[in-house]
Amino acid sequence: ADLGSMGYFELQLSALRNVNGELLSGACCDGDGRTTRAGGCGRDECDTYVRVCLKEYQAKVTPTGPCSYGYGATPVLGGNSFYLPPAGAAGDRARARSRTGGHQDPGLVVIPFQFAWPRSFTLIVEAWDWDNDTTPDEELLIERVSHAGMINPEDRWKSLHFSGHVAHLELQIRVRCDENYYSATCNKFCRPRNDFFGHYTCDQYGNKACMDGWMGKECKEAVCKQGCNLLHGGCTVPGECRCSYGWQGKFCDECVPYPGCVHGSCVEPWHCDCETNWGGLLCDKDLNYCGSHHPCVNGGTCINAEPDQYLCACPDGYLGKNCERAEHACASNPCANGGSCHEVPSGFECHCPSGWNGPTCALDIDEEFGLVPRGSGHHHHHH
């Protein structure tokens, strides 16, 4: 499997001038034995290609040793001297093509790296003469130049010019982070995503920028409906407000009272906190029976007792649960006009003589009710 890369070191060769068409050894590229000091090189020009070695920063550059940061090479670019299009948009397109395995600008070398870019580096650039019959060896070296320095990842190219023993080289370099890597060392990873691992895009610094409706370090926490009481509700999908057990309402801010709670409410779920004057487990017991029913009569004073219970304190002369009965009701001789008084559970009854009527035999039938015959039934007065 491809390891992928955190970034790329890019080198774009712009120009190479080898006016005499010679090798670093002084020999001619065509290999006919002559040197420039013996009358110049012949018809055959050098078949020039470039090799690039990238390694750790060295104050004193050693051309040998491993290219610890990577290496690359170009195809044959031209003869003794040539110019290539400057790096820029073409180079960017080529880089994109090279990463997908497509054709790239011949003068562009892309060296991927899979480590945090250290910023300091050593670059060794070698121009070689291509010979079909031989493998590269020191005899075919045209020029070797080196540069040790620092470079930060950015889109801008940095120009380098080298005047070697034999050839002059002009090139541009830059370091760029791969598309999902950020920071000065290209080791900060951020890939935009919208799935169960997170819902975010990446800002220019590689920080996760949560999509609308999401929050948290990985943008995996949904932002609930505005007003949702997050102590008693929440959401897994943005804009919702799902209540915890025991809570209800649009914003999960209403507790669920104890089932069957009548005259009560709750502050905590499954409670039944009674309204004033109500009691019992379900707040269904009236603690103020007196106030709501007024059961005592005849001036009796009502006293609340157990829930749903009361007592009547009766005034003198009255008794019964509600003070509805008069005590010794006939003692005051309530019956007039010769009526006879009889005590009954509800008070007294007057048995009126012929011609009189009413609760206390005070109504004259002849005067008041001419139509009512004398001696009609009993008339009672209840206290």
Epitope: A1, N180, F189, R191, F196, T236
Partner: antibody, heavy 122, light 107 residues
Framework: EVQLVESGGGLVQPGGSLRLSCAAS????????IHWVRQAPGKGLEWVGG????????DYADSVKGRFTISADTSKNTAYLQMNSLRAEDTAVYYC???????????????WGQGTLVTVSS | DIQMTQSPSSLSASVGDRVTITCRAS??????VAWYQQKPGKAPKLLIY???FLYSGVPSRFSGSGSGTDFTLTISSLQPEDFATYYC?????????FGQGTKVEIK
Amino acid sequence: EVQLVESGGGLVQPGGSLRLSCAASGFTFTNSDIHWVRQAPGKGLEWVGGITPADGYTDYADSVKGRFTISADTSKNTAYLQMNSLRAEDTAVYYCARSYWSSSPGSAFDYWGQGTLVTVSS
Amino acid sequence: DIQMTQSPSSLSASVGDRVTITCRASQDVSTAVAWYQQKPGKAPKLLIYSASFLYSGVPSRFSGSGSGTDFTLTISSLQPEDFATYYCQQSYISPSTFGQGTKVEIK
């Protein structure tokens, strides 16, 4: 050719440990997520957990949180599932799968390994 | 966790039949639903991703639709190689969850 190959399954006693490996090839390991999915005998699929090898981010199902650990070695293109405090209910075929990155919401598992059987029994 | 409820849990059909399997999510999962086919002793294979996109190499008789909470996998004309178990999966909210599966058997 994309390939995922699991190994490390076997018989283990309750309370024991086992480490499964998932060797990846044929794709850029650090440009993918690797997930572990299990299937108990005769049952359906259950997502166990996953990792983003590029930054080491992991997530787990509640049923294995605190007992299982997923890791990845990018130099070896291999993901691991370290299983501790194993229970009888962890008995299953364990698959590793690669997630398919799409610009649409979600991430499907486009390549799966052949699976490795883990049996937890005394 | 989001529950993915598939229906039916099994069905019998003949070659050439049109088969529809539904999957209902307990909460909105956008279009983050995939469908897989699994044959006995084998690993699952991806058929549909993002609710309606046909995965590379999958025959066009398979199609998917839906968004939010209701999703459908349709096989327009059932072929002998399609007899298998089918699973839906949501990958929008962690943890990712699968449906219980639908077994498609030969009538």
